[in-house]
Interface confidence: low
């Protein structure tokens, strides 16, 4: 399949709308400080360079891989050393050295300003007034907050950002049409952004056959009636998607998703009876529809895993002639008779299987040492089940705000030496697990609650790279990628701490609280009690609840005050002196 | 940190004209809309203007419709807002926001406008 001019063919493929999306999506996932209007002129050029290679593939630099044309054209932006420092450096370096040193610097919490949503109003004229940059900035906006964003995804959030806008400034009340659907929006595109990360961390860090042992499990539960060799077929083509977006090969990856689409639909006998509807859509549409398709029924009459994978005498033969494909075997066939179980607990039961095999098919009497095989699976399966089990019921007991609070202080007593920032915006994604979760049927909960954990600890294990400040968090981090929540569940109070100092600053509020967001709000509040779990880790949770409590009467009482600044000055101080005594600090 | 400080107010007579200003810092002006907010004595904040962050939409407050007009320069990150047929009802406190919040983005203490005779 191979093509004169790289740059034509994707150009031709995807049309030039997505063209110039993708590669301006491309461009402010790299270089995440430029100005917006840097970016539209580096695409521009790059679009009228395609355009030429279009009409003419042997034209000069057309046969360049997309590589070397955008990374020279990156290189082109002259405040490069001012603005990205040593990034600079990738410039002096050859393809494919200069994309991966561009990747190393991709920056998972960049500097930028919090996006504020101007009034309504506002927005519809700029959106009416240009669509085109409106939509543009959108891209951009996103894109350079999340460098790992899935970027034909970001083109399906685009369509319904314009449709919603499009939609809602004809409305009589714009406001109450327009901020619900921008508010989904931006939920779901954060968790659009998590999730993905989770599966370029999944590659980058642990490599091609973790993310294919994950694609296999997801996609058993998912498909269970397709055969073995079309899943293994659907993991090859889905690990080569990923691996573009993830790898900044943004265009072969959109391009290579629309075929996956496709080739999807036109054997979804074989596949799935739930794919019907999504088949109908257009192609972005189509392509989010498939991703999140529900699982389709399990066959009936699924014979015992045992006789194949533990009574056959062929175990260790079978294991031994193809190690990889025995195991997705047998992942295949556990994640399609468990779509109650979570992917991460799929795949310890697979190595703890393989690690089984590998130490019995060298012993004396394999059968014999591999037979209660089965029997190991059982605390492995216990271990979420009580977990999520006790954490919802702490949910229903207590709600969202203070479930969340619960983790904040268990989480900081775990990692004290986490930033604030960190601890708080992590134990509130955690919290969140409670409402996502806890809601669902016993079969739905362990899949729901377990692997949206793995997407939000990869949040702090990605956050926890970019400054390593916890050895314990690290170990975590890195030692294995489906162990992850285990190992976080498992630290205790970290005894090594060593409290943080006493700072009233910290704890000192104005008025400029009672005009926040309840949400806002929360927030405040949450970052007042991980700051004082680092002060006094070994703080009960009744005296930290009094503090709270406190707390939260000397916020409500401030805020109705007349003058309000006096109040938080002086009732602050009051409060300050009556935490260190209840706390004795 | 985002820094907002206006300038540019002052004692005029009715019918008179002042031109505000608004120097931004501290984060990208150019991508962002902004808006000019009063506060008259013993009333709530009032949008008087809001400009999109390429100047290609702006919106005025029916009161000072054909009187005012807001503009931006993004090279200079400055705000402005001309002020021209001034009346008393327009005595206040201006501040300039970022988006159109009427919540005052920075810690700019505004600039007082008295229109009297």
């Known amino acids: 399949d191979a093509h004169k001019s790289e740059v034509a063919h994707r150009f031709k493929d995807l049309g030039e709308e997505n063209f110039k999306a993708l590669v301006l999506i491309a461009f402010a996932q790299y270089l995440q400080q430029c100005p917006f209007e840097d970016h539209v002129k580096l695409v521009n050029e790059v679009t009228e360079f395609a355009k030429t290679c279009v009409a003419d593939e042997s034209a000069e630099n057309c046969d360049k891989s997309l590589h070397t044309l955008f990374g020279d054209k990156l290189c082109t932006v002259a405040t490069l050393r001012e603005t990205y420092g040593e990034m600079a450096d990738c410039c002096a370096k050859q393809e494919p050295e200069r994309n991966e040193c561009f990747l190393q610097h991709k920056d998972d919490n960049p500097n930028l300003p919090r996006l504020v949503r101007p009034e309504v109003d506002v927005m519809c004229t700029a959106f009416h007034d240009n669509e085109e940059t409106f939509l543009k900035k959108y891209l951009y906006e996103i894109a350079r907050r999340h460098p790992y964003f899935y970027a034909p995804e970001l083109l399906f959030f685009a369509k319904r950002y314009k449709a919603a806008f499009t939609e809602c400034c004809q409305a009589a009340d714009k406001a109450a049409c327009l901020l619900p659907k921008l508010d989904e929006l931006r939920d779901e595109g954060k968790a659009s952004s998590a999730k993905q990360r989770l599966k370029c961390a999944s590659l980058q860090k642990f490599g091609e056959r973790a993310f294919k042992a994950w694609a296999v499990a997801r996609l058993s539960q998912r498909f269970p009636k397709a055969e073995f060799a079309e899943v293994s077929k659907l993991v090859t083509d889905l690990t080569k998607v990923h691996t573009e977006c993830c790898h900044g090969d943004l265009l072969e990856c959109a391009d290579d998703r629309a075929d996956l689409a496709k080739y999807i639909c036109e054997n979804q006998d074989s596949i799935s009876s739930k794919l019907k509807e999504c088949c109908e859509k257009p192609l972005l549409e189509k392509s989010h529809c498939i991703a999140e398709v529900e699982n389709d029924e399990m066959p009936a009459d699924l014979p015992s895993l045992a006789a194949d994978f533990v009574e056959s005498k062929d175990v260790c033969k079978n294991y031994a002639e193809a190690k990889d494909v025995f195991l997705g075997m047998f992942l295949y066939e556990y994640a399609r008779r468990h779509p109650d179980y979570s992917v991460v607990l799929l795949l310890r039961l697979a190595k703890t299987y393989e690690t089984t095999l590998e130490k019995c098919c060298a012993a004396a009497d394999p059968h014999e040492c591999y037979a209660k095989v089965f029997d190991e699976f059982k605390p492995l399966v216990e271990e979420p089940q009580n977990l999520i089990k006790q954490n919802c019921e702490l949910f229903e007991q207590l709600g969202e705000y203070k479930f969340q609070n619960a983790l904040l202080v268990r989480y900081t007593k775990k990692v004290p030496q986490v930033s604030t920032p960190t601890l708080v915006e992590v134990s509130r994604n955690l919290g969140k697990v409670g409402s996502k979760c806890c809601k669902h049927p016993e079969a739905k909960r362990m899949p729901c609650a377990e692997d949206y954990l793995s997407v939000v600890l990869n949040q702090l294990c990605v956050l926890h790279e970019k400054t390593p400040v916890s050895d314990r968090v690290t170990k975590c981090c890195t030692e294995s990628l489906v162990n992850r929540r285990p190992c976080f569940s498992a630290l205790e109070v970290d005894e090594t701490y060593v409290p943080k100092e006493f700072n009233a600053e910290t704890f000192t509020f104005h008025a400029d609280i009672c005009t926040l967001s309840e949400k806002e709000r929360q927030i405040k509040k949450q970052t007042a009690l991980v700051e004082l779990v680092k002060h006094k880790p070994k703080a009960t949770k009744e005296q930290l609840k009094a503090v709270m409590d406190d707390f939260a009467a000397f916020v409500e009482k401030c805020c109705k005050a007349d003058d309000k600044e006096t109040c938080f000055a002086e009732e602050g101080k009051k409060l300050v002196a009556a935490s260190q005594a209840a706390l004795g600090l | 940190q985002v820094q907002l400080v206006e300038s540019g107010g002052g004692l005029v007579q009715p019918g008179g004209s002042l031109r505000l200003s608004c120097a931004a810092s501290?984060?990208?002006?150019?991508?962002?809309?902004m808006s000019w907010v009063r506060q008259a004595p013993a009333k709530g904040p009032e949008r008087v203007s809001a400009?999109?962050?390429?100047?290609?939409?702006?919106i005025y407050a029916d009161s000072v419709k054909g009187r005012f007009t807001i503009s931006r320069d993004n090279a200079k990150n400055t705000l402005y807002l001309q002020m021209n047929s001034l009346k008393p009802e327009d005595t206040a406190v201006y501040y300039c926001?970022?988006?159109?919040?009427?919540?005052?983005?920075?810690p700019g203490q505004g600039t007082q406008v008295t229109v009297s005779s």
């Open positions: 501290g984060f990208t002006f150019g991508q962002f809309g």
């Open positions: 400009i999109s962050s390429d100047s290609s939409g702006t």
């Open positions: 926001t970022i988006g159109s919040s009427t919540t005052p983005s920075g």
